[in-house]
Amino acid sequence: MKVLQEPTCVSDYMSISTCEWKMNGPTNCSTELRLLYQLVFLLSEAHTCIPENNGGAGCVCHLLMDDVVSADNYTLDLWAGQQLLWKGSFKPSEHVKPRAPGNLTVHTNVSDTLLLTWSNPYPPDNYLYNHLTYAVNIWSENDPADFRIYNVTYLEPSLRIAASTLKSGISYRARVRAWAQCYNTTWSEWSPSTKWHNSYREPFEQH
């Protein structure tokens, strides 16, 4: 039994890191393998993650971690019984994939303005709480070409757009994702999408 693709890990910079790897053949990850991990820190202890299958030869492990700080470094040991298959390390702050924003809501009761709000996925004491920026994706269910991205570079988790920038009388969907420039993170997954019917009063045209 050998590791074909070494484990790569990403952290949500809060409490979970996800590691994925591939073996050289079909493997029952949960019964044959264990991933041991430990924070390099005087008051830490070793933990064991039981991996799950991720395709025939693929394995994935969800590591429960202490609240992350930038200096953290974890040792990783992949075992098959008594055999050490791979040894490595992982700095969560260098491989961050933020959590997805939640509670995306479209408020249509403001006159001819759409207000989109969502929740920051981090608690206020987390470093990323004040460092997330967002991308909002809005698209028409009727017209695949009507697809747009709004970059929200301020901290407030909201976006205002004129209803008239979208077509009237049709349904739209929106979703939002996050990233943090300070740690050069990847983008989060998209939030669940929300749907609304766009309608607004057409301005009276004078001839």
């Epitope: 409490s15 820190f41 008051l43 830490s44 202890e45 700080v69 004491d125």
Partner: antibody, heavy 115, light 109 residues
Amino acid sequence: EVQLVQSGGGLVHPGGSLRLSCAGSGFTFSRNAMFWVRQAPGKGLEWVSGIGTGGATNYADSVKGRFTISRDNAKNSLYLQMNSLRAEDMAVYYCARGRYYFDYWGQGTLVTVSS
Amino acid sequence: EIVLTQSPGTLSLSPGERATLSCRASQSVSSSYLAWYQQKPGQAPRLLIFGASSRATGIPDRFSGSGSGTDFTLTISRLEPEDFAVYYCQQYGSSAGWTFGQGTKVEIK
């Protein structure tokens, strides 16, 4: 808002015992290492003890064998049991959250050791 | 055990002036594990700088940290009245634990 609220200080005779408490709120207590740091009157800061999320502990040489740090994650609380107290243990004791450094501190509680 | 020595013991300056505080370690310290705190009379210490140069949440940008190895510096670019206090450096060592410098008092001249 992260808060650490301390209780349990007071006057004790040399050789006596005292238990300090620290209640945390506004953060996930169970995922953070916790510490005690003290400051003798007119002196600097001295790290006393720390406890990891899994219960691993460490102590300064000056208190080893006399002080015991513990935590109750269900109550979001940190404790310091101080036995065989000496005059040199007299100080303001702070609880703190942190790891390699201490990012949030309690308000401090005064422990007076005097006959 | 790593010993941190801060200098000067006392710094007498006027508001608006620049303050430069030094922290010297008896052996090399990882920059990741070096922090600075501010303490005012009757108050708990407050984290200013971690990782030698990163400002903690809510700390004004007039505070900056620098250095590596055995020599570290805290700089306050323009002293405000509320900056007069005692400042401590602190390091974490994987064997000896956490140690503080003896402190530098910044007082009004």
